[in-house]
Structure formats: C-alpha cells, structure tokens
C-alpha cells in the first residue's frame, strides 16, 4: 500500500479554515475530504492511517487512485462509493489494513472504471457473495475489475465464523460470473486448506494467480486446463506433498506459465517419481533446483532434481495377516 507524500506540493490537504466560508453552499465538486490529501494533477486521493470510520462522502469527482488504507472502516455497505455524479474515473482502490470485517452486496457498485481493488489485511469474516457482482442474478453485468488483491483476509482463528472461509471467498469470486475479465488474483496468506474445484474454470482470463503461504495439501481436484492465458502461478509456502500426473500435464500444457513451488514439504517416496521426471524435463518451474524433500526422514533436504527412481521407494504395506499387533 502506498503512503501519502505530505511534502509533495501537488497535494492539497483539506482546509479547515475554509469551512465557515462555504458551509452555506453545497460542497465543492473537487474539494478534498477532511483527513485526506488530494492531487488533482495525479488524480489521486490519499486518506491513509487516519482512523476513518466511514468512506468520505465528499470525494472529488476527478479521483482515479484512491488510498483508504490503515483506517477503521469495519463495514463497507452497499453503494459505499456511489456518488452523484458517480466516481466515473476511479480505477484503483486500495482499502488494505482498514479493519474491514464485513463487505456487503453491491459495495463497489457505480464504479464503472474500477480495475484494481485491494482488500488485503482485512479480517473479512463476512464477505457477501455479491460483494463484487453487485446483484444476486445468476449472470450479472460484467465487473470492470482486472486485479483483485485479497492477501491475508482471513480473520484470526478465534474470530472466524463457523463456515468454510474458502467457500465464502470463492462464492464472492464466482457470483454472477461477474469476474470473467479478471487477470490478476492474489489470495496469499489465507490459511486455505483446499481450492474449490470449480473456481479456476470460471476465471478464464487469469494471467496471474497467487496462492502462496496457504495450507494447500493437494491440487488433485483443481483444474488449470481452461487457464490458457495463465503466466504465473504462485504456490510457494503451502503444504503440498506431491503433484500428480494430471496436474503436471495440465501445467505443461499452458503456453505461458511460470510456476513457483518453493518451501513445500515434498514427500519423496514412490509417488514422487512422476513429478521428479517432469521437473527434470520442464522449463515452467522457476527455481526448480531449490526444491527439496521434507519426508521421509532419510530423504530430508535431498534436492528433487538429483533423485532417481531407485531413491523413491515406498515401504511395503503388509497384508493384515502378517501385521504384528
């Protein structure tokens, strides 16, 4: 998140001494809200670390880049940015670290140019399925969003609702098929245990997907086949044990892909043979020479690229009659 440059001469802070002079008149169309800094030249408004509890109502119509980071917003109601006239130029909206726990249906409606949205570092316990689509229709009007940044939006464990956090986020991503044009999706650091199988198929325009620093154990039911434009897939710092043949083939079939797999607890047994073979041949894995085994103990820290089939054995499973009690 960007912080304001208070010394920049192009930024004007709201002028409290003017308030009495204009209080009898309607608000000026391009005034700067209290506790914010504005640059008409840069089309930017920064209301950063000001403990704001609501989105300012008097945002200037010229705003293209809006930073509302480090506040105490708690709730984004429907039409939180709806203005008359509308904020027709607003293209980038950063709400990170503003203690949002609830984003309601239609929170981003009436922002026809909104391309980048960052909700990172907010404990989003209550993300409406229609937060991004704006309506509960089975097919909504397409959202203009191209980048959606949702890193570290999982609430602390003792503050979570009794429902699937993954399911709640995915419902918001898929509602009304509104995000068909999304190119960048960041979902890092969200304690995801799994990725619902239908999510990627319905985001066909994705170029960049960041799932790093989650708790993903397997990609068995995740299909990358439709993501023909995918350029980067970040899976670092998860709990992946092995990638199976189906996943390997799908990744290899993506024309522009770069995959990042560092810091996963790879299990180097007989089930790893296909992945090792693939790693030796593929160019899609970045830093593949850094991938090492975590289990079994005898294989710990061995480099995957240096393994051969003789290294990758599975302890035989004894039939029940031969097992000792």
């Amino acid at each position: 998140s960007s912080s304001p440059t208070s010394s920049a001469s192009s930024f004007s802070s709201s002028a409290p001494f003017l308030a009495s002079a204009v209080s009898a008149q309607p608000p000026l169309p391009d005034q700067c809200p209290a506790l914010c800094e504005c640059s008409e030249a840069a089309r930017t408004v920064k209301c950063v670390n000001r403990n704001l509890t609501e989105v300012p109502t008097d945002l200037p119509a010229y705003v293209r880049n809006l930073f509302l980071t480090g506040n105490q917003l708690a709730v984004l109601p429907a039409g939180a940015f709806a203005r008359r006239p509308p904020l027709a130029e607003l293209a980038a909206l950063n709400l990170s670290g503003s203690r949002l726990d609830e984003v309601r249906a239609g929170a981003f409606e009436h922002l026809p140019s909104l391309r980048q949205l960052d909700l990172s570092h907010n404990p989003l316990a209550d993300l409406s399925p229609f937060a991004f689509s704006g309506s509960n229709a089975s097919v909504s009007a397409p959202s203009p969003l191209v980048e959606l940044i949702l890193n570290h939006i999982v609430p602390p464990e003792d503050e979570r609702q009794n429902r699937s956090f993954e399911g709640m986020v995915v419902a918001a991503l898929l509602a009304g098929r509104a995000l068909q044009g999304l190119r960048r999706l960041e979902l890092a650091s969200n304690h995801f245990l799994y990725l619902p199988r239908d999510v990627l198929a319905q985001l066909p325009s994705l170029r960049h997907l960041d799932l790093s620093n989650n708790s993903l154990v397997s990609l068995t039911y995740v299909s990358f086949r439709n993501l023909t434009h995918l350029e980067s897939l970040h899976l670092e710092d998860n709990a992946l044990k092995v990638l199976h043949n189906g996943t390997l083939a799908e990744l290899q079939g993506l024309p522009h892909i770069r995959v990042f797999l560092d810091n996963n607890p790879w299990v180097c047994d007989c089930h790893m043979a296909d992945m090792v073979t693939w790693l030796k041949e593929t160019e899609v894995v970045q830093g593949k020479d850094r991938l090492t085994c975590a289990y079994p103990e005898k294989m710990r820290n061995r480099v995957l690229l240096e393994l051969n089939s003789a290294d990758l054995d599975c302890d035989p499973i004894l039939p029940p009659s031969l097992q000792t009690s």
Partner: nanobody
Framework: EVQLVESGGGEVQPGGSLRLSCAAS????????MAWFRQAPGKEREFVAA????????RYTESVKGRFTISRDNAKNTVYLQMSSLRAEDTAVYYC???????????????WGQGTLVTVKP
C-alpha cells in the same frame, strides 16, 4: 438476544482514571458491534465509543478521543472502556450496547445493559 452486564463505575477526581467492563452472554458474537453510550442527568443518551468483535475496529465521539480507549477480549466475551483524564462533564450513567451496525445512533443498537454510574468530582 445478548445479555449485557456493566461494572467498574464509581467516584473519581478530575484527571483520574476508571475502567468499565461489559460482560456479554447469550450469543455475543451475533452482535457485530459493541458500544458504550452515556447519559448525564437531564440530557439525552449519547454515543461514546464502539468496537467490532471481529477485527477490532474502533470509533469514538470527538470529546473523548485521546482520553478513552475501547477494547474487547473475545475469549472472555468482555468489552472494556478505559477512561483517563476524566472531567466533570464525563459524569453520567454509562451503558453498554450491542448491535449489528457500525453506527453512533441509539437505534443502531438492539441490546442494552442496565448501566453503571461514573461520577467525576473534586
């Protein structure tokens, strides 16, 4: 429905401090916001501060900013109001309230405690 019980009120000298507690029972997390209001003799009940159970966002009325701090302990289902630099005009019955909205209006809150009296006098 949420049951709320306040404690910690009392008499204190100007400039002194007090900490009020509000214990919530029933289904406290069904109310997303916890707040403190106060009512001085002969005056309307007014908003003092609020906190969200999840995320811990806070808000204050202008007259207490920098002097009062609201906080919550989710494990204990309790909300606190730490009051310092107390003034005579802070004398009032302080009420704990619970509601869904993120607001400052009396009507934003559906469940109320019985109140605890704070008296600031030399």
């Amino acid at each position: 429905e949420v049951q709320l019980v306040e404690s910690g009120g009392g008499e204190v000298q100007p400039g002194g401090s007090l900490r009020l507690s509000c214990a919530a029972s029933g289904r406290p997390f069904s109310s997303k916001t916890m707040a403190w209001f106060r009512q001085a003799p002969g005056k309307e009940r007014e908003f003092v501060a609020a906190v969200r159970w999840i995320g811990g966002a806070t808000r204050y009325t202008e007259s207490v900013k920098g002097r009062f701090t609201i906080s919550r302990d989710n494990a204990k289902n309790t909300v606190y109001l730490q009051m310092s630099s107390l003034r005579a005009e802070d004398t009032a019955v302080y009420y704990c309230a619970a509601g869904q909205a993120w607001g400052t209006k009396f009507t934003d809150y559906s469940d109320w405690g019985q109140g605890t009296l704070v008296t600031v006098k030399p």
